[in-house]
Each structure stands twice: as C-alpha cells, then as structure tokens.
Amino acid sequence: QKPHKRKTQLKAAGCCEEMRELKAQVANLSSLLGELSRKQESDWVSVVMQVMELESSSKHMESRLSTAESKYSEMNNQIDIMQLQAAQTVTQTSADAIYDCSSLYQKNYRISGVYKLPPDEFLGSPELEVFCDMETSGGGWTIIQRRKSGLVSFYQDWRQYKQGFGSIRGDFWLGNEHIHRLTRQPSRLRVELEDWEGNARYAEYSYFALGNELNSYRLFLGNYSGNVGKDALLYHNNTVFSTKDKDNDNCLDKCAQLRKGGYWYNCCTDSNLNGVYYRLGEHRKHMDGISWYGWHGANYSLKRVEMKIRPEAFKP
C-alpha cells in the first residue's frame, strides 16, 4: 500500500521556485512536529490535516511532472524522514510501548508507510524500520514480506533471512528474528497475492507464529480463511525454515536449492512465496517461482505478494 499522503505530494516537484516553496512548507511541518513532541502530544490528527493541506496546495504543480524526475527522490526522502521522525518522537514520549504497526494504529497513526519501531531494552530488540498497512481490512498490519518488483534476490543464506534483507519500500523480508519477536504475542497472518492477469486474492490465518532460531523458526499456523481457493501454507505448517546453506527440510533433495529461496520447505512446496521473481512471459515456465498451488499451478509465478501480521486481539 502506498502512503496516501504522498499520492500527489511526491509528484509535485516542479520548477525551483515552487520547489523552494514546497521545501519551506516541509520545514514548517517539521517544526510543527518538533513542537508536538516537545509538548509530549500524541495526537497525530492535526499533523495529518497539515499533510492534507500540503497535498492540495501542491496540486497545481502536477503539470510540471516532466521536469520533476531529478527532484523526486529528494522529496521522497524528506517526507519519509518526517514520517519516521514523527513515529519515533511519539513513541519516545508516549507512556505506552510501541511494539508493531497495530500499536501505532491505536495511537492514531493511520497513514500507510514506513515507521521506526523503537528499541525494546527489556526484550533486547533493536530499533526496527517497518512498513505499516493502515488501510487493508481494518489496518494495523506490519508487513513482513513483499514481492512486487523482482529487484531483490530472495535466494539468500540463513543469516540474511534471520536479520532481514531488501528494501522496505520495495521487495524485502523483514527477518526471521524480528518476525519471531513480533509473533510472541498471538498474531494473525494475511497473505495477499496478485497474478499477471490482474486478479487479486488473499489468505488469512487466525494464528501465526515463528519459533526461535534454536527451533529453526518453525512455522505455526491457525485456521485458514480467504478467497484464494486452496490453503497452500497448510503443507508447510509445523515445518522449519530452510535456506541454501541450512538444509532443514523434510526431503532427500535440498528444497531451498531446488526452489531458490528460503522458506518452510517440506518436500518441497505447495507455496513458494520467497521463490524467484519471474516476469510476464517467463512466469509460467519454472518450478522455482513465486507460487501458490491451487490458485495457479506449481509453475506459475505470481506478480505480487505481501505477507502481513497483526495481533489477534487487534480492534480497528
């Protein structure tokens, strides 16, 4: 999900004059955020209103998009930094701990995008950058995996899958250690899938948890619901994680090497959501693609996948 506040805002990067004006508005907004944090206010609504105003004031610049390319990333970075700083500031000044995107949602952070979760000294967990989906099915989802561009290889080793890899705004794996920590409270899993024909489906699980590293990040799943047809994670339930350098599967063949990913390989797959990203034209030819057996065949590689979690007890 793209952050709503950026739909037109990030397009607006016209000539230098207007750019400076917009940067000034950004600076004003930053200063407003600083003031909010100093007063230890947790109300994000006013900030959202400012952002909406900023959006509308930038709309007149959309005709100049042809010259905006070079300045796009700079604006993108500034606004992301603001959003991260906003999240960070509130979590530091709030009496209630922030564990995940659902915690942020309950504190009125309602815009999908990148946030920083603060370190938890008690649990010994570091600061964590996450992408929050605050819109889908009530919001509050922490995204743990995304495949959409094919720019990141998912044929990674155990260490990479443990700590996470990729780009939080693009294709990424959040990291087994982080996912294990996040799912120590009872959680739900939502898997969203899109094929190359533009069809979208989802699968939801009433319970989702990963064991710790000593237990090789074993997968625990609850009941399935959704519209994808077949529960293609059931075959992987209660299996441990395997990578190209750690063959933990239940197979005489090394599934991680055959399926080119890291996953809860059994022997081998009903789904392979961390497989190879094959583009249109190649997407029907390989057994090691991003597959979900039952919706499409074992050799159909999907266009887009997102895996996201939130606490079972979450109330929108």
Epitope: N250, L252, D253, K254, C268, T269, D270, M287, Y293, A298
Partner: antibody
Framework: EVQLVESGGGLVQPGGSLRLSCAAS????????MSWVRQAPGKGLEWVSA????????YYADSVKGRFTISRDNSKNTLYLQMNSLRAEDTAVYYC??????????????????WGKGTTVTVSS | DIQMTQSPSSVSASVGDRVTITCRAS??????LAWYQQKPGKAPKLLIY???SLQSGVPSRFSGSGSGTDFTLTISSLQPEDFATYYC?????????FGQGTKVDIK
C-alpha cells in the same frame, strides 16, 4: 538392467564393527538417493538410513543414530553402511535399495523401487 | 515418529478372492505411502507408490487408495503368486516407517 548387490555381512561380536557395501549398476548412480532397510529374523521390515544422490543429506532411524553411518562413492557406484557398536538387536538381513523420486505438483514422493538380495549380519558372542 | 498400523495381520483367502488390506498412519501423511510385497527368503518388491500409482510391471489387479491417515491395498482377484506378506511404508517424514506387515496365505 538395474542391479544392486550387497556384501560385507557376517558374524561379529557385540560392540564390534562392520562395513556393508552395495554395488550398483544399470543406472546413473549419482542421480539417485539410496537407502538401507533391514529385517530381523521372522520380523517385519525396518528402515535404517537414506542418503541423497550427492551424499549431502543423510537420515537415520533412531535405533541406529550415532552408531551407523551411511555414505557413498559415486565414482565407484557404491553405497556403504558403516556399523559401529553393534548390538544383538542389529542382527538382520540388510537390503540396499534405490530410491526413486516422483513429483506431483510441487511435492516429491520417494519410494524404494529396486532392492538388492540382501546380506546377513549376525551380532553374537 | 509416524506409526503405521496394518490390519489384518494375516488373512486367509482363496484364488480369485478380493483381498483388502488397510494401513493407518498415526498422523496425516498426504499421499506419501508405498506398498511392498515380500515372499519368503526374497527381497521386497514395490507394488504401489504415492498411495495409488501402480509401479511399472505390476499387474493391474493391485490397486491402492487413500490419503491422509487411511490407506487401502486391494487385490481384485487373488492369484497363486500373490500369496506373500504385504507392507505399507510412509515417506512423508523421516524416519521412514513400515507397517508390521499383513500375511496373505491360502485358505
């Protein structure tokens, strides 16, 4: 014709060691997983161990784990079972078997499609 | 470990009879089941793999069915050469395990 011929069986004292061999012919040995299965006198079949085609993956029955080692030499088309710390209950006919693999959707199905005639191991003092 | 339980442990039948042997797994094994035939003093012979696929060269009077925990081997019309002991075996997870065997003998 696919053939498996076991050798190396015999009489050994408890606590002793023995190495079984299985010579394979008639197929591309390195492409197939292999397995050992045993049968005690008058008893049923008991799976002992299996090894992948490359030799990189090995599996054992709990009853032999830590005492038996399965290995293979693909250049010699030979499968081995090194048996240490032998016990009376290891007395059996030992069969080597070729493991065939079939894939249905994304799943691999294994089954032992060709068996040797067996070699007898007797552990007794 | 997955336990495999066969029933009956023995069956007496006549040539031409239909014989059914069942095998139950202690937990779901999908279709990861094979059936073997063994005659006295001989090595086992594969009959059925993946629960219902007939191995090449095996007569069509042998058939397998089932999925999950309950499986069946059926001999539609028993022939003299079919008197033997039959074993089921799961390959769903290691360690692979066999049933205790079902002996089919002459009535």
């Amino acid at each position: 014709e696919v053939q498996l011929v076991e050798s190396g069986g015999g009489l050994v004292q408890p606590g002793g060691s023995l190495r079984l061999s299985c010579a394979a012919s008639g197929f591309t040995f390195s492409s197939y997983a292999m397995s050992w299965v045993r049968q005690a006198p008058g008893k049923g079949l008991e799976w002992v161990s299996a090894i992948s085609g490359s030799g990189g993956s090995t599996y054992y029955a709990d009853s032999v784990k830590g005492r038996f080692t399965i290995s293979r030499d693909n250049s010699k088309n030979t499968l081995y079972l090194q048996m240490n710390s032998l016990r009376a209950e290891d007395t059996a006919v030992y069969y080597c078997a070729k493991v065939e693999r079939d894939m249905v959707r994304g799943h691999y199905y294994y089954y032992m499609d060709v068996w040797g005639k067996g070699t007898t191991v007797t552990v007794s003092s | 470990d997955i336990q495999m339980t066969q029933s009956p442990s023995s069956v007496s039948a006549s040539v031409g009879d239909r014989v059914t042997i069942t095998c139950r797994a202690s937990q779901g094994i999908s279709s990861w089941l094979a059936w073997y035939q063994q005659k006295p003093g001989k090595a086992p012979k594969l009959l059925i793999y993946a629960a219902s696929s007939l191995q090449s060269g095996v007569p069509s009077r042998f058939s397998g069915s089932g999925s999950g925990t309950d499986f069946t081997l059926t001999i539609s019309s028993l022939q003299p050469e079919d008197f033997a002991t039959y074993y089921c075996q799961q390959a769903n997870s290691f360690p692979w395990t066999f049933g205790q065997g079902t002996k089919v003998d002459i009535k």
